[in-house]
Interface confidence: low
């Protein structure tokens, strides 16, 4: 029978689509050779036993966004060819135990966004061909042992957003082909040792947005093929030594939004493919030597929004390929002159929103490729002479929202800023904080005109001047021997600011730093 129900559309008689709130019962009769049936956005509340008897060729059945609350046990009888079944976005609370017994060739089963409160242990027992099972967004308080034991071909399992608080360590024991396991948005507080041991082919494990407080040391040791591990927005306060030791293929690890207080050296043990490490929004107070030394391919390290007050000089040892380092919004007051020495490929560093009072003259000595430096909103009163001399690629420097002390010691910085004005961007220029007579005046000044002896910068520099670079043709070089005749008075005269202060962009981060 090639007819098409009046409330449906039939494409080439093998694809049937029935949509609309006016549909309150299963349309019939359905074309006997239908291969794809979609019933979407209807008010169907019940699925009787006999509606699919005549469409045994059906391969895909999609009943999504309906009001479906009740399915009879034999509803899918005679659908032996069915490979894809979606019942997502309905109001199902329970499924008959033998509901799926006749659809044993299913490859995908989507049950997301229903109100399922339990799964029977035998619910999926005949699904040896099932590759994807989606149970996201239900009310499953626990997963019975054995429920997945027969799903030996499963590659993707989504159990997110259900609200279960614990997992049996044996629940995944037969899922050796699983590649993606998503357990995010639950209330897991503890994951038993051995839970993931059978998942040797796992590539993605999503555990974010739970209440996990501790991780067993060997939790991931059998997951050597893991590429993406999401642990963000949990309550993790401690990373056991060796927790990440057996993850050679990991290329993404998120730990932001936890309660980490410290990182022991070597905790991020050899992960040669890890390119990004997200650690923002934790409670980390200090970084020890060699905290990241095994991550020689890391390119992005985000440590913003922590409570860092101390960084050991060797904290970043080994990060020879790091491009982006985000340290903004911490409690840093001082930095060791060698802290960035091993970061030869660093391009962007964000240090804004800290309490930095001064910077060592050698802080950027080995980081010749720096392109952006964010130093706004700190406690800087001056900078060492020559601190930016060698940074030929520097194109963005943010210095505003610091209490710059505009006495005679600021003159070398002032002159360098005039010559390198283009690097300061257009958002906000640095302004003087003291002495009182120049408070609020721009530190980039066209004309400072008063006589006096030449002055030196506040520290003995390793490099002796603030030159421009050829990237900025309007600039001219200034050497350390340039005689600057200035008064030694605290107050300037003839202060002509270039332009009024712009609205302030307090954050000024790159995309990767905006964590």
């Amino acid at each position: 029978y090639y007819g098409c129900p009046s409330e449906c559309t039939c494409s080439r008689a093998s694809q049937v689509e029935c949509t609309g709130a006016q549909i309150v019962a299963m349309p019939s009769p359905l074309p006997w050779n239908a291969m794809s049936l979609q019933i979407l956005n209807t008010h169907i509340t019940e699925l009787p036993e006999d509606k699919f008897l005549n469409i045994s060729a059906l391969i895909a059945l999609k009943m999504e966004k309906n009001e479906l609350a009740n399915i009879m046990p034999g509803a899918f009888r005679n659908l032996g060819s069915l490979r894809h079944l979606s019942l997502a976005n309905n109001k199902l609370k329970n499924l008959p135990v033998r509901l799926f017994q006749d659809v044993n060739n299913l490859e995908t089963l989507l049950l997301s966004n229903n109100q399922l409160v339990q799964i029977q242990p035998a619910q999926f027992s005949q699904f040896s061909n099932l590759k994807e099972l989606q149970l996201y967004g239900n009310n499953l308080e626990y997963i019975p042992e054995g429920v997945f034991d027969h799903l030996v071909g499963l590659t993707k399992l989504n159990l997110g957003n259900n609200g279960f608080t614990h997992l049996s360590p044996r629940v995944f024991q037969h899922l050796g082909n699983l590649q993606v396991l998503r357990l995010y948005e639950n209330r897991l507080s503890d994951i038993p040792m051995g839970t993931f041991d059978a998942l040797g082919n796992l590539q993605e494990l999503a555990l974010q947005e739970n209440q996990i407080g501790t991780l067993s040391p060997g939790l991931f040791h059998n997951n050597r093929n893991l590429q993406r591990l999401y642990l963000s927005n949990n309550h993790i306060s401690h990373l056991p030594p060796g927790i990440f030791m057996q993850l050679p293929h990991l290329n993404k690890l998120t730990l932001f939004g936890n309660s980490l207080k410290e990182l022991s050296p070597g905790v991020f043990g050899p992960m040669p493919n890890l390119r990004e490490l997200w650690l923002y929004n934790n409670h980390i107070t200090s970084l020890p030597d060699n905290a990241f030394s095994h991550l020689n391919q890391l390119q992005v390290l985000i440590l913003s929004h922590n409570q860092l007050s101390y960084i050991s000089p060797g904290a970043f040892n080994g990060l020879t390929n790091l491009r982006e380092l985000s340290l903004h919004t911490n409690a840093l007051q001082d930095l060791d002159g060698n802290v960035f020495r091993s970061l030869a490929n660093l391009r962007n560093v964000s240090l804004q929103n800290n309490r930095l009072r001064q910077l060592p003259g050698s802080i950027f000595a080995n980081v010749n490729g720096l392109m952006t430096i964010q130093l706004q909103n700190n406690n800087l009163e001056n900078l060492p002479l020559g601190i930016f001399d060698h940074l030929g690629n520097l194109c963005e420097l943010r210095l505003y929202d610091n209490p710059w002390r505009c006495d005679s010691n600021i003159l070398p910085l002032h002159d360098w800023l005039i010559l390198n004005r283009a690097r300061l961007g257009t958002d906000t220029l640095p302004v003087c904080s003291s002495p009182a007579s120049v408070r609020g005046q721009s530190l980039v000044i066209i004309n400072v005109n008063f006589p006096g002896p030449s002055v030196q910068g506040p520290e003995t520099p390793e490099v002796s001047s603030y030159p421009d670079t050829s990237s900025y043709p309007d600039s001219t070089s200034i050497s350390s021997t340039t005689e600057i005749t200035r008064s030694t008075d605290d107050d300037y005269t003839d202060l002509n600011t270039i332009e009024p202060i712009d609205d302030r962009n307090t954050w000024g981060m790159t995309d990767a730093q905006s964590g």
């Epitope: 996201y136 997110g160 957003n161 998503r182 995010y184 948005e185 999503a206 974010q208 590429q227 993406r228 999401y230 293929h249 290329n251 993404k252 493919n273 390119r275 990004e276 391919q297 390119q299 992005v300």
Partner: antibody, heavy 123, light 113 residues
Framework: EVQLVESGGGLVQPGGSLRLSCAAS????????MAWVRQAPGKGLEWVAS????????YYADSVKGRFTISRDDSKSTLYLQMNSLRAEDTAVYYC????????????????WGQGTLVTVSS | DIQMTQSPSSLSASVGDRVTITCKSS????????????LAWYQQKPGKSPKLLIY???TRQSGVPDRFSGSGSGTDFTLTISSLQPEDFATYYC?????????FGQGTKVEIK
């Protein structure tokens, strides 16, 4: 400036083989997933295959699985597509593309495209 | 596999017109792990390679004029050209990169009225 230059296209008989190459420059090749996308004459775009940071991370469209092999040589900044058992329906312009985000999985967009190389499968 | 369906398949418009192209995916492209929609838009002119316009459903690629904007979430997405310019006459494709196989819409050809 990112540049992707494909070569190796041409006329081949059904059942024959062809190897496409893509020479990349202007970026750090090893940092990116790479892909091939094709376009049959007068038709839309079809993703063919992607490759990650090593040979173990390869993904294929069902239509070419088992017949095509994507590979890369990071030392030469070159992407390859070995095409075997070619069929008439493989006739298309083949584009070499770079995924958009470095140090990231293949699950992101195609930011840069080569000019394409035409493969014609006909007897 | 995720199917992508664009509409209309072609449209005629004049310079200065506001043009809207829609794209529907067969499953949601919003990943709750990062709250991003895994969808991109491309422009292709005859005889040329495709060019990326939009990624993450609404983020404009560097250098793309701001008359191009993307919106939508989940399964329904839109590309809008606020004021059509002569150089905008081309074919536009949406693409999902949520999961391989990465699939494209069939294309929408924007022609001169």
């Amino acid at each position: 400036e990112v540049q992707l230059v494909e070569s190796g296209g041409g006329l081949v008989q059904p059942g024959g083989s062809l190897r496409l190459s893509c020479a990349a420059s202007g970026f750090t090749f090893r940092d990116y997933y790479m892909a091939w996308v094709r376009q049959a004459p007068g038709k839309g775009l079809e993703w063919v295959a992607s490759i990650g940071f090593d040979e173990s991370r390869t993904y294929y469209a069902d239509s070419v699985k088992g017949r095509f092999t994507i590979s890369r040589d990071d030392s030469k900044s070159t992407l390859y597509l070995q095409m075997n058992s070619l069929r008439a329906e493989d006739t298309a312009v083949y584009y070499c593309t770079r995924h958009g985000v470095s140090y990231y999985s293949g699950d992101n967009w195609f930011a840069y495209w080569g000019q394409g190389t035409l493969v014609t499968v006909s007897s | 596999d995720i199917q992508m369906t664009q509409s209309p398949s072609s449209l005629s418009a004049s310079v200065g017109d506001r043009v809207t192209i829609t794209c529907k995916s067969s499953q949601g492209l919003l990943y709750s792990g990062d709250q991003k929609n895994y969808l991109a838009w491309y422009q292709q002119k005859p005889g040329k390679s495709p060019k990326l316009l939009i990624y993450w459903a609404s983020t404009r690629q560097s250098g793309v004029p701001d008359r191009f904007s993307g919106s939508g979430s989940g399964t329904d997405f839109t590309l809008t050209i606020s004021s059509l310019q002569p150089e905008d006459f081309a074919t536009y494709y949406c693409q999902q990169y949520y999961d391989p196989p990465y699939t494209f819409g069939q294309g929408t050809k924007v022609e001169i009225k």
